[in-house]
């Protein structure tokens, strides 16, 4: 049960982390004008990934695609990519895990295959997030540096009659829900990870249910004694101190939970 | 089609007190930034206030603190309520829609504040 | 505050001729976020209120005739009449859209010669 609970929550974890990471990648605000020096501005600036933007005070909003590729600053490029790989890997993680929940039933697919897409989703989940933490951070330090850069060209730049406003970005709202939702995709995959290790000691528990069934000479053994999962060396029965643990005996009692899980 | 009329001006002493009113027709002011431009006799024109989404207003900093933009969406109507006024605040007083590029594009006639003793 | 400059105070022109118009801002109206010079051009009849001609420097307002135009970017912009016509006897403003307060420039008379 407790797997089944990890499995499922680092899903739903994954799918909101996944969902922010597009709504981020989307957003026009990743960077916004830094109000500071001219709060009464009339003219508000921000800037997404793909284009940026105007809000007047008049009310109107216009905003321009970036439409060339080869004139864009490299660092902008990386963003772009990463946020791309992290949507695509956690899109398909997301398609993985589906059929390797533990509450879906898809003909005779055992446990072990679910226990390694479960797996398999996890890790993709985590690079997910990872890439989206990676692209919101690069692009937050970027804003740092010519945060800083036009801050000195303003101070620095007016010799002579005119001066020219520069306009400083500061961070916009796409980076918090960036950070959030690679945070959310990343621990969303570790869950999943987890639900993994706990995923194939019961595919064992299963045959090992079947096999014992036919008999009638097995002994109560109390406590929560379950046969080795395989993974090591260690073949002999091992007491596992977990909650979710049930005894051979429970399992017995129920071999038809098995058949609708 | 478009109409702003604007009306309450007249003559005042100086530290008096005048509201002045813009009423639209054919347009809901409520759903556009709006503003307050006078002009002096025989002088240029000065933007005087701006009430823009939200209710956030701005003011010229000689009328900061004395004058107060408003608006009233049932009756359709801006305001501009102009206390302390002094001689140098006489003027055609003129309320305009903003749009596009901040642009002021819809004018009334304007109502004229003379402050004088 | 910005400070918008316009030259001339007074201009006068014959029918048929050019008309320029310059106005200079102390500092720029260039937004980075869709690159529009935020600046419009007014005209003003005697006894009549503004009437907006120009708007994002060069975008012509509908209905105006197409013999105004309006050029420049940054800080230095020009309003041109290409073929002075006699309605066109009037005062013209330019004004920043950029930063509050809106300012406007102090006009300049455009007469007929």
């Known amino acids: 049960m407790a797997v089944t609970a990890c499995q499922g929550l680092g899903f739903v974890v994954s799918l909101i982390g996944i969902a922010g990471i597009i709504a981020a990648t989307c957003m026009d605000q990743w960077s916004t004008q830094d109000l500071y020096n001219n709060p009464v501005t009339a003219v508000f600036n921000y800037q997404g990934l793909w284009r940026s933007c105007v809000r007047e005070s008049s009310g109107f909003t216009e905003c321009r695609g970036y439409f060339t590729l080869l004139g864009l600053p490299a660092m902008l490029q990386a963003v772009r990519a990463l946020m791309i790989v992290g949507i695509v890997l956690g899109a398909i993680g997301l398609l993985v895990s589906i059929f390797a929940l533990k509450c879906i039933r898809i003909g005779s697919m055992e446990d072990s295959a679910k226990a390694n897409m479960t797996l398999t989703s996890g890790i993709m989940f985590i690079v997910s997030g990872l890439c989206a933490i990676a692209g919101v951070s690069v692009f937050a330090n970027m804003l740092v540096t010519n945060f800083w850069m036009s801050t000195a060209n303003m101070y620095t730049g007016m010799g002579g009659m005119v001066q020219t406003v520069q306009t400083r970005y500061t961070f916009g709202a796409a980076l918090f829900v960036g950070w959030v939702a690679g945070g959310l995709t990343l621990i969303g995959g570790v869950m999943m990870c987890i639900a993994c290790r706990g995923l194939a000691p019961e595919e064992t528990n299963y045959k090992a249910v079947s096999y014992h069934a036919s008999g009638h000479s097995v002994a109560y053994k109390p406590g929560g004694f379950k046969a080795s999962t395989g993974f090591g060396s260690n073949t002999k029965n091992k007491k596992i101190y977990d909650g979710g643990a049930r005894t051979e005996d429970e399992v017995q009692s129920y071999p038809s939970k098995h058949d609708y899980v | 089609e478009v109409q702003l009329v604007e009306s309450g001006g007249g003559l005042v002493q100086p530290g008096g007190s005048l509201r002045l009113s813009c009423a639209g027709s054919?347009?809901?002011?409520?759903?556009?930034?709006m503003s307050w431009v006078r002009q002096a006799p025989g002088k240029g024109l000065e933007w005087v206030s701006s009430?823009?989404?939200?209710?956030?207003?701005y003011y010229l900093d000689s009328v900061k603190g004395r004058f107060t933009i408003s608006r009233d969406n049932a009756k359709n109507t801006l305001y501009l309520q102009m206390s302390s006024l002094r001689a140098e605040d006489t003027a055609v007083y003129y309320c305009?829609?903003?749009?596009?590029?901040?642009?002021?594009?819809?004018w009334g006639q304007g109502t004229l504040v003379t402050v004088s003793s | 505050d910005i400070v918008m400059t316009q030259s001339p105070d007074s201009l006068a022109v014959s029918l048929g001729e050019r008309a320029t118009i310059n106005c200079k801002s102390s500092?720029?109206?260039?937004?980075?976020?869709?690159?529009?010079?935020?600046l419009t051009w007014y005209q003003q009849k005697p006894g009549q209120p503004p009437k907006k001609l120009i708007y994002?420097?060069?975008t012509r307002e509908s209905g105006v005739p197409d013999r105004f135009s309006g050029s420049g970017s940054g800080t230095d912009f020009t309003l041109t009449i290409s073929s002075l016509q006699a309605e066109d006897l009037a005062v013209y403003y330019c004004q920043s859209n950029y930063f509050y307060p809106l300012t406007f420039g102090q006009g300049t008379k455009l007469e007929i010669k």
């Open positions: 500092q720029s109206l260039l937004s980075s976020g869709n690159q529009r010079n935020y």
């Open positions: 994002w420097a060069s």
């Open positions: 305009a829609r903003k749009y596009h590029g901040n642009a002021l594009d819809y």
């Open positions: 054919g347009i809901t002011l409520s759903t556009y930034a």
């Open positions: 009430i823009i989404s939200g209710g956030i207003t």
